[in-house]
């Protein structure tokens, strides 16, 4: 049975130009974390495998950098990313737990922070 | 829809060197997480791991066969080619490639039909 | 070399519930040996079921499972098809290289 549940840091906004840490936690489980693969809308930016480390896109080599922990650092935001994006954590015995991120990348030097959320 | 097919000589002599193709359409080896591995099954026997090969160029190979095996990939061609040096009638097997996904753990997702490889003087 | 072994041949009943195992000879099956689960039925292409232990493929239905018990991986059928009358082959992945099992072929009667 799936008890755990993501928090992500929910709906998120930046500056263009800047960088943006991409974060989720799975809470309420004991389940082990093997693999957490990031995907921006069908796209896979990145993975984190327990055993093999870091693996980066090459399409998004030059703007993702691992971490901090299983998240990931979005840099030299455009206003292309703003959009939808996931952490798929794979766990056993649990099974796949998603959280989802939503990312507005602003023109101006306004960008609130959004409150954070949880996912069942 | 994933395919992939291997092809190469049906028969080679001991000692020779033993080249497959494997060529695949649906997928690209320039993409992200995909991979491409070969095993092999001599008749009546299980299943043997021999090497594979991810988008990023890194190289795995089976350590009791490593000094004997290259893997190597042409992505323009959609293509993984296996060479096997110094063969000998006990390499007479059947030999498949396997499309390899990083992402999901479904590391031998997709299977080719595989290719009969004698080995006989 | 570790050597991977799987019951060589298993029997059950349409309805029934029947579980594969795959033991190692280095010790016990951990989730770091990321345990495939792969089919062939007669005629037919080899195909992936379960990868990483646990992550069952797009196209396989639920009745398939992957876990661990005890120091084994395993791969449990619920309610079992005539259609799953097939070989099943187990591969361990050892930090840099894989090793399959001999295979358990599966008999549904």
């Known amino acids: 049975m799936m008890t755990g549940t993501i928090e992500t840091t929910g709906n998120i906004s930046a500056e263009k130009g800047g960088s943006i840490i991409l974060q989720c936690h799975l809470s309420s489980t004991t389940a082990q974390v093997t693999q957490v693969n990031w995907e921006q809308q069908d796209q896979l930016l990145a993975i984190c495998n327990a055993d093999l480390g870091w693996h980066i896109s090459p399409s998004f080599k030059d703007r993702v950098a691992p971490g901090p922990g299983l998240g990931l650092t979005l840099q030299s935001l455009t206003v292309n990313d703003t959009g939808e994006y996931f952490c798929i954590y794979h766990t056993y015995p649990d099974g796949t737990y998603t959280g989802r991120i939503f990312l507005e990348v602003l023109e101006s030097s306004v960008a609130e922070h959004g409150a954070r959320f949880q996912i069942p | 829809q994933v395919t992939l097919k291997e092809s190469g000589p049906t028969l080679v002599k001991p000692t020779q060197t033993l080249t497959l193709t494997c060529t695949f359409s649906g997928f690209s080896l320039s993409t992200f997480a995909m991979g491409v591995g070969w095993i092999r099954q001599p008749p009546g026997k299980a299943l043997e791991w021999l090497a594979h090969?991810?988008?990023?160029?890194?190289?795995y190979y089976n350590p009791a066969l490593k000094s004997r095996l290259t893997i190597t990939k042409d992505t323009s061609k959609n293509q993984v080619v296996l060479t096997m040096t110094n063969m000998d009638p006990v390499d007479t097997a059947t030999y498949y490639c396997?499309?390899?996904?990083?992402?999901?753990?479904?590391?031998?997702?997709?299977w080719g039909q595989g290719t009969l490889v004698t080995v006989s003087s | 070399q570790a050597v991977v072994t799987q019951e060589p041949s298993l029997t059950v009943s349409p309805g029934g519930t029947v579980t594969l195992t795959c033991r190692s000879s280095t010790g016990a099956v951990t989730t770091s040996n990321y345990a495939n689960w792969v089919q062939q039925k007669p005629g037919q292409l080899f195909r992936g079921l379960i990868g990483?232990?646990?992550n069952r493929a797009p196209w396989v239905p639920a009745r398939f499972s992957g876990s661990l018990i005890g120091d084994k991986a395993a791969l449990t059928l619920s309610g079992v098809q005539p259609e799953d009358e097939a070989e099943y082959f187990c591969?361990?992945?050892?930090?840099?290289?894989?090793?399959f099992g001999g295979g358990t072929k599966l008999t549904v009667l």
């Open positions: 990483g232990t646990n």
């Open positions: 396997a499309r390899m996904d990083y992402s999901y753990f479904a590391w031998f997702a997709y």
């Open positions: 591969a361990l992945w050892y930090s840099n290289h894989w090793v």
């Open positions: 090969i991810w988008w990023d160029d890194d190289k």
